[in-house]
Interface confidence: medium
């Protein structure tokens, strides 16, 4: 039977009819203990005939009286089957059983949905002893019910290792609809369909859903929960929510903003972190992402030379970490630099252009075709070379550095000469006769000294030994890290 307790839960009759120890008598219980641990020992007294049980698990006692009559089966008495009440109301329900006093060590426990209720529940077991039986009433009360209290409650009693189980008492807590799934904020592509989901539950069921867009209802007729709203596409931001209705009233979901994806705003604050002869390290602050994650960024570099035709070098990089080293630039050059970033919709406009300059660098290659002659008549060594390619000087050539090392038995001395930038030959005095002179040349800019050429050796004979054969740079080896010309 379903007993409705809409606004108030009243105690229900514990037994179908009078019996010794029934609450319909004026007996005061001999003992009343709070059900703190989930188990209560039953106090046993001399037996009387219990009232007839209805349903539930039954224990058939094997003990017989003096006349050898079997005792009747034990069972919990039938009680209310279904209690319906509103959230936050109080409820009390119980189960009862009459137990012959011959039984020892009986315990009653409460279970909900298959799990034993232990601890912090308000359960009381009361004992009403008589000559032959003891009526045991186990009460369970909840002062303010919540949805989580919904479920099937039963009593269990153990007697002589037998388990007796009561009929279930179904507690149904009704209230306003409760959302189990609410619409989520989304970022969507313009004019592209998308779905929103709303789900709410009672009891009471059914729960009906209305959709609301920008404060206006979308559907005239409600849909049963769960509901999926298909929006064919938006051209501007909108706020959606859903209303859930049941017999108890209305609950409104959170409002969610649906944003329209757009191209990002341009990056701001592009700044120069470091500059070398061939590279510039820049950083930037990304603009607004247009409701779509940045994918990558493009650094655009153009020569800030009035005579240049404005063509742009493009370097692509990941969107993070908002830092990029632009390499392979020319030394001592001016550049305009802009940054643009993209998301799935497209590229942002370019940031404001900034001006940056590379510094002067040391030359990247040595002078070429170094040749050394001995001019014995004047006791000089003539050195000739070709200047490095202009584009590999990495700055304004200020001259050359010549290293000449003189080695003879037990002697080695190195001398350095500086030559002006217009020279491509030099003359040095013979320092030691009957010795080897090793010559190397490096180009020099304000950015530093470039690499020295491969060594060229010439033997300086003792006086009177004529040898005019020139020495020149050997073919460079394959490990040379620059273009060999």
């Amino acid at each position: 039977a379903i007993t409705e307790a809409r606004e108030e839960a009243k105690p229900y009759p514990l037994f179908p009819g009078p019996f010794p120890g029934s609450l319909q008598t004026d007996h005061t219980p001999l003992l009343s203990l709070p059900h703190a641990s989930g188990y209560q020992p039953a106090l046993m007294f001399s037996p009387t005939q219990p009232g007839r049980p209805h349903t539930g698990n039954v224990a058939i006692p094997q003990v017989t009286s003096v006349e050898s009559k079997p005792l009747p089966p034990l069972a919990f008495k039938h009680t209310v089957g279904h209690i319906i009440l509103s959230e936050h109301k109080g409820v009390k329900f119980n189960c009862s059983i009459s137990v012959p006093n011959i039984y020892q060590d009986t315990t009653i426990s409460w279970w909900k949905d298959g799990k034993e209720l232990l601890g912090a529940h308000h359960a009381i077991t009361q004992f009403y002893p008589d000559d032959e039986v003891t009526a045991i009433i186990a009460s369970f009360s909840i002062t303010s019910v919540q949805r989580s209290d919904n479920g099937s409650y039963i009593c269990k009693m153990k007697i002589n290792n037998e388990e007796i189980v009561s009929d279930p008492i179904y507690i149904e807590v009704q209230g306003l609809p409760h959302f189990t799934k609410q619409p989520e904020s989304m970022n969507v592509t313009r004019n592209t369909a998308f779905n929103l989901t709303c789900q709410a539950v009672g009891p009471p069921e059914p729960v009906n859903i209305f959709w609301v867009q920008n404060s206006s209802r979308v559907n005239e007729q409600p849909e049963k929960s769960p509901s999926v709203l298909t929006v064919p596409g938006l051209t501007e931001m909108a706020v959606f929510s859903c209303e859930a209705h049941n017999d108890k009233g209305l609950t409104v979901s959170k409002g969610v903003q649906i944003n329209i994806k757009a191209i990002p705003s341009p990056p701001t604050e592009v700044s120069i972190r470091n500059s070398t002869a061939h590279s510039i390290l820049i950083s930037w602050v990304p603009g607004f992402d247009g409701y779509s994650p940045f994918r990558n960024c493009s650094i655009q570099v153009k020569e800030a030379d009035p005579l240049s035709n404005g063509s742009v070098m493009i370097f692509n990089t990941s969107a993070l970490p908002h830092l990029y080293q632009i390499k392979q630039l020319q030394a001592l050059a001016n550049y305009s630099i802009g940054v643009s970033c993209m998301n799935e919709i497209g590229w942002s406009a370019v940031s404001p252009w900034i001006l940056a300059s590379t510094t002067e660098g040391a030359p990247s290659v040595a002078p070429l075709n170094v040749t050394v002659f001995l001019n014995e008549s004047s006791d000089n060594v003539d050195i000739r070379w070709m200047k490095p390619p202009t584009k590999q000087q990495d700055g304004e050539l200020v001259g050359y550095r010549i290293s000449h090392v003189w080695q003879s038995a037990g002697i080695s001395k190195e001398l350095l000469e500086e030559v002006g930038q217009n020279g491509s030959r030099a003359r040095i005095s013979v320092q030691v006769h009957n010795a080897t002179c090793t010559v190397r040349i490096a180009a020099v800019t304000r950015g530093g000294v470039g690499p020295f050429s491969d060594p060229v050796k010439i033997f300086i004979p003792a006086h009177g030994w004529v040898d005019y054969a020139p020495s020149s740079t050997p073919a460079p080896g394959n490990a040379d890290p620059v273009l060999i010309i």
Partner: antibody, heavy 120, light 108 residues
């Protein structure tokens, strides 16, 4: 976008000279080398040399030294390659290419090619 | 002069197959100086891969390159009909700049 547009086909007699032009656009002409590469019918690619338009610095393949001259006109962003004393084995398609300037030397853009036929 | 030798000279392949072209150099070359080009019939060559393994702009990801020292490889995964062309390797290590003799790829 970067473009290299070459002059039209030429037919020459042995011993004559030919001058092929290559007009560059879409980038700073003086920043990159212009290289010349040729391809004889049914054959592979052969590098002839480069010129650096900013200062006219040239580097030629020894095979063509004395017969080839590369020049540029920066005012019109045009490069020229002249090959003298033509022989029948100079019959080829001549390409101008942009040499990437980072000394790792590759050719990132190519002209459409100019067919030079040497025949008596 | 650095001589580049490609293998094979010619290859006939069915679509979706994997193709490998090798290029052997007569001297050791740093991988930064090694590049590949594609030339379709009656067209100019086109830069395909620079610095051994970096795809040039617009080149499909089915192309890849690898190698070091003297041995370099161009690989085409899952060949497509449009890949019918002659492929050349090139070194930028020393003058004269040189190319391999080419590998002609025919689609069956």
């Amino acid at each position: 976008q970067v473009q290299l547009v070459q002059s039209g086909a030429e037919v020459k007699k042995p011993g004559a000279s030919v001058k092929v032009s290559c007009k560059a656009s879409g980038y700073t002409f003086t920043t990159y080398d212009i290289n010349w590469v040729r391809q004889a019918p049914g054959q592979g690619l052969e590098w002839m040399g480069w010129i650096y338009p900013r200062d006219g610095y040239t580097k030629y393949n020894e095979k063509f030294k004395g017969r080839v001259t590369m020049t540029t006109d920066t005012s019109t962003s045009t490069a020229y390659m002249e090959l003298r004393s033509l022989r029948s084995d100079d019959t080829a398609v001549y390409y101008c290419t942009r040499g990437y300037y980072d000394n790792l030397y590759y050719f990132d853009y190519w002209g459409q090619g100019t067919t030079v036929t040497v025949s008596s | 002069e650095i001589v580049l030798t490609q293998s094979p000279d010619f290859q006939s392949v069915t679509p979706k197959e994997k193709v490998t072209i090798t290029c052997s150099a007569s001297s050791i070359i740093s991988s930064n100086y090694f590049h590949w080009y594609q030339q379709k019939p009656d067209q100019s060559p086109k830069l395909l891969i620079k610095r051994t393994s970096n795809l040039a702009s617009g080149v499909p990801s089915r192309f890849s390159g690898s190698g070091s020292g003297t041995d370099y490889t161009l690989t085409i995964n899952s060949l497509e009909a449009e890949d019918a062309a002659t492929y050349y390797c090139q070194q930028g290590r020393s003058v004269p700049l040189t190319f391999g003799q080419g590998t002609k790829l025919e689609i069956k």
